[in-house]
Amino acid sequence: KAMHVAQPAVVLASSRGIASFVCEYASPGKATEVRVTVLRQADSQVTEVCAATYMMGNELTFLDDSICTGTSSGNQVNLTIQGLRAMDTGLYICKVELMYPPPYYLGIGNGTQIYVIDPEPCPDSD
């Protein structure tokens, strides 16, 4: 079953390579278990950036080596991606799945274009 997912159109990463955005889904029922996946689309290639599952009201659990962190509040997921560089600029798509209880719902956002600008190196202070 399909579900609507909303996310901002554009986000600019900080000078430290950190970008945050909210992924909001219109839950048709009372889900207790949710899976969130962030995918990056660039040059028609799609790659998985990170994925997490969480029980409603609890923290998101990403893998230990994940570049993502996040928190949830109701039907909103606040996602933060770190360690970004200019080459990571692209469309970051939020995918939400309501895993339990049945029925299973799937929603895919339109994507957030994240722009990353590498900071200029500090000039020598001679």
């Epitope: 399909a2 996946t37 995918l39 689309q41 799609v46 790659t47 998985e48 994925a51 798509i93 995918k95 799937l106 895919i108």
Partner: nanobody, 119 residues
Framework: EVQLVESGGGVVQAGGSLRLSCAAS????????MGWFRQAPGKEQEFVAD????????YYADSVKGRFTISRDNAKNTVYLQMNSLKPEDTAVYYC????????????WGQGTQVQVSS
């Protein structure tokens, strides 16, 4: 055109085992993910398990965790569901599904295979 064909269903006693297979035909694919869903008569469709190519990462519904194992053979474009310690409540039609990319959703579905667990 991609086709998913399930096999391995049948009737089994409670506590028994079955192994479902789902073979993709119609070309050579690099699916982002393959999964299993089930639907019992008069009930909503339920997610069972899936496996993502990226890291071979698996995910299971709580109701089957520790009893079912999903695996895939990329060379054969086949995904398996090993079901152990079956319970009467596992009785359902089991559907295989595949997604080509993470942002396409479940693009392809099989016709389903019936699993009947008798007590």
């Amino acid at each position: 055109e991609v086709q998913l064909v399930e096999s391995g269903g049948g009737v089994v006693q409670a506590g028994g085992s079955l192994r479902l297979s789902c073979a993709a035909s119609g070309g050579t694919f690099s699916f982002y993910g393959m999964g299993w869903f089930r639907q019992a008569p008069g009930k909503e469709q339920e997610f069972v398990a899936d496996i993502r190519t990226s890291a071979g990462r698996t995910y299971y519904a709580d109701s089957v965790k520790g009893r079912f194992t999903i695996s895939r053979d990329n060379a054969k474009n086949t995904v398996y569901l090993q079901m152990n310690s079956l319970k009467p409540e596992d009785t359902a039609v089991y559907y295989c599904a595949a997604e080509m990319s993470g942002i396409s959703g479940w693009d392809y579905w099989g016709q389903g295979t019936q699993v009947q667990v008798s007590s």
